[in-house]
């Protein structure tokens, strides 16, 4: 997949920033707001920001610029630079009228079918589990294989470096074709197939990627919010995987929720399957020692472990993956349509 160019974004923060730089008033306001970072702590949902008057004034000046509605894309070049601008500008949107975070990612339209050739799988035993089959599909694709080997190397060995492992995981889930990445991670296993479940749980190399001692979930979020990329991915996840009702309706769409979920892998907030026997997922953190923020911590933890939107989205994708290999599929080669952007 070619990386999205700025021009394909409706209003890229990089473009908007360049426009702003050409306007002395906007440029000065942006710089001032950027320097306000130290005086405005990033508030957690339970806190109200305290804002100096000059920062409010700079924010007010930026509210009329094209920066206000600017967005980024997960696969764009200079993504981190774009996100840095987004979060600086986000303060202008929210100062004095604190709004909960809004995802910085724009959903771009993709309609090109992605082809999978299943005929090459005949080298596998017919009764091989689906996680093995999806792993083989990745191996048979040059790009997927190369990216998977890169994180496999970085995340293996007794002395693996966690930050290097995470960076390679992030790269894999960002650059591998979405159906490959989703197939690898969200492969269905028979309820009694522990080997398959273990293979699935080990997809992200949890021994290296996840912290050896579970930190407090709120501390983990604080750490995540200090990094524009992690913060963006978490906010994107909370936007698209918010459950609307107990049926598991997602606030936007299941496909967007899954994309956002996979986008967290390789960040400080990397989730994973909790066992080999079911499809429950969770963050690798604890709410012990949260004091009077216990409820807030449990809500964050529950957004992963007790989220009917996420649970249903994962289940639906696994059902889809099962159907790909069912006997009644008409051709060994078929196209998987990428999801259209929609309202």
């Amino acid at each position: 997949d070619p990386l999205p160019t700025e021009s394909r974004l409706m209003n890229s923060c990089l473009q908007a920033r360049r426009k702003c730089q050409a306007d002395p008033t906007c440029s000065a306001a942006y710089h001032h707001l950027d320097s306000c970072t130290s005086s405005i702590s990033t508030p957690l949902p339970s806190e109200e920001p305290s804002v100096p008057a000059d920062c409010l004034e700079a924010a007010q000046q930026l509210r009329n610029s094209s920066l206000i509605g600017c967005m980024c894309h997960r696969r764009m070049k200079n993504q981190v630079a774009c996100l840095d601008i987004y979060w600086t500008v986000h303060r202008a949107r929210s100062l004095g009228n604190y709004e909960l975070d809004v995802s910085p990612y724009e959903d771009t339209v993709t309609s090109k079918p992605w082809k999978m050739n299943l005929s090459k799988l005949n080298m596998l035993k017919p009764d091989s589990d689906l996680c093995l089959k999806f792993a083989m599909l990745c191996t048979l694709n040059d790009k997927c294989d190369r990216l998977r080997k890169a994180y496999g190397e970085a995340c293996s060995g007794p002395h693996c470096q966690r930050h290097v492992c995470l960076r390679q995981l992030l790269t894999f889930f960002e650059k591998a074709a979405e159906p490959h990445a989703q197939g690898l991670l969200l492969c269905p296993c028979a309820p009694n197939d522990r080997g398959c479940g273990e293979r699935r749980r080990n997809t992200i190399a949890p021994n290296c990627a996840l912290p050896p001692v579970a930190p407090n979930c709120l501390e983990l979020r604080r750490l995540c919010f200090s990094d524009p990329l992690c913060r963006s991915r978490l906010v994107d996840f909370q936007t698209h995987c918010h459950p609307m009702d107990i049926l598991g309706t997602c606030a936007t769409e299941q496909s967007r929720c899954l994309r956002a979920y996979l986008g967290l892998i390789g960040t400080a907030m990397t989730p994973n399957f909790v066992s080999n026997v079911n499809t429950s997922v969770a963050l690798s953190c604890t709410c012990r020692g949260s004091g009077n923020l216990q409820e807030e911590c449990e809500m964050l933890e529950g957004f992963f472990s007790h989220n009917p939107c996420l649970t249903e989205a994962i289940a639906a994708k696994m059902r889809f993956h099962s159907q790909l290999f069912s006997q009644d599929w008409p051709h060994p080669t078929f196209a998987v349509m990428a999801h259209q952007n929609e309202n």
């Epitope: 949902p45 909960l100 936007t239 918010h242 459950p243 609307m244 009702d245 107990i246 049926l247 309706t249 997602c250 606030a251 936007t252 769409e253 299941q254 496909s255 809500m299 259209q340 929609e342 309202n343």
Partner: antibody
Amino acid sequence: QVQLVESGGGLVQPGGSLRLSCAASGFTFSNYTMHWVRQAPGKGLEWVSVISYDGSSTYYADSVKGRFTISRDNSKNTLYLQMNSLRAEDTAVYYCARIVRMDIWGQGTLVTVSS
Amino acid sequence: DIVLTQSPATLSLSPGERATLSCRASQSVNSHYLAWYQQKPGQAPRLLIYGASNRATGVPARFSGSGSGTDFTLTISSLEPEDFATYYCQQMDGFPFTFGQGTKVEIK
């Protein structure tokens, strides 16, 4: 554009039946849970029924349980509400709705139950 | 069934004033599944807030929601002329889903 359009409302006698339809366009209908909500003249909103995106789960308000049936045809992008044994208190404007972050409501269709 | 009671029934305020609407549940509601709607005469409702505190697409920042358990609040920080309408809370935490009876915000 993204919209929901209800039809099938009208005047019916108590004990009669009516089938409401809601045609969806501009979005992938099969990806969404859908609701029916009604509003009696001059009164508040009353939730009626919900159906999961694939039609496998349906739920109803106590006041319509056993009389109304919600269904959907994803190939036709259409939501239905079959209303049997209608009563005077079922008189209302019926809305179909997609209740997500970017919600969509139909314009409503009036059902009048009167002899 | 979960009964939602909104108060006050009517709120008479002037443009620019702050409006605070309350929604009380007969039993605890998971805040993920609490929503607020605005409805103007002759129009369909419009989702304002979902998950107790998240603004729906296109909803102005002057609308905010808060609360947990059995007590939820919708706040309009500074009323604009177009905000005079009826507001409903709804829970989607237990079947049947239910609405509150509504709070009418009228011009004083």
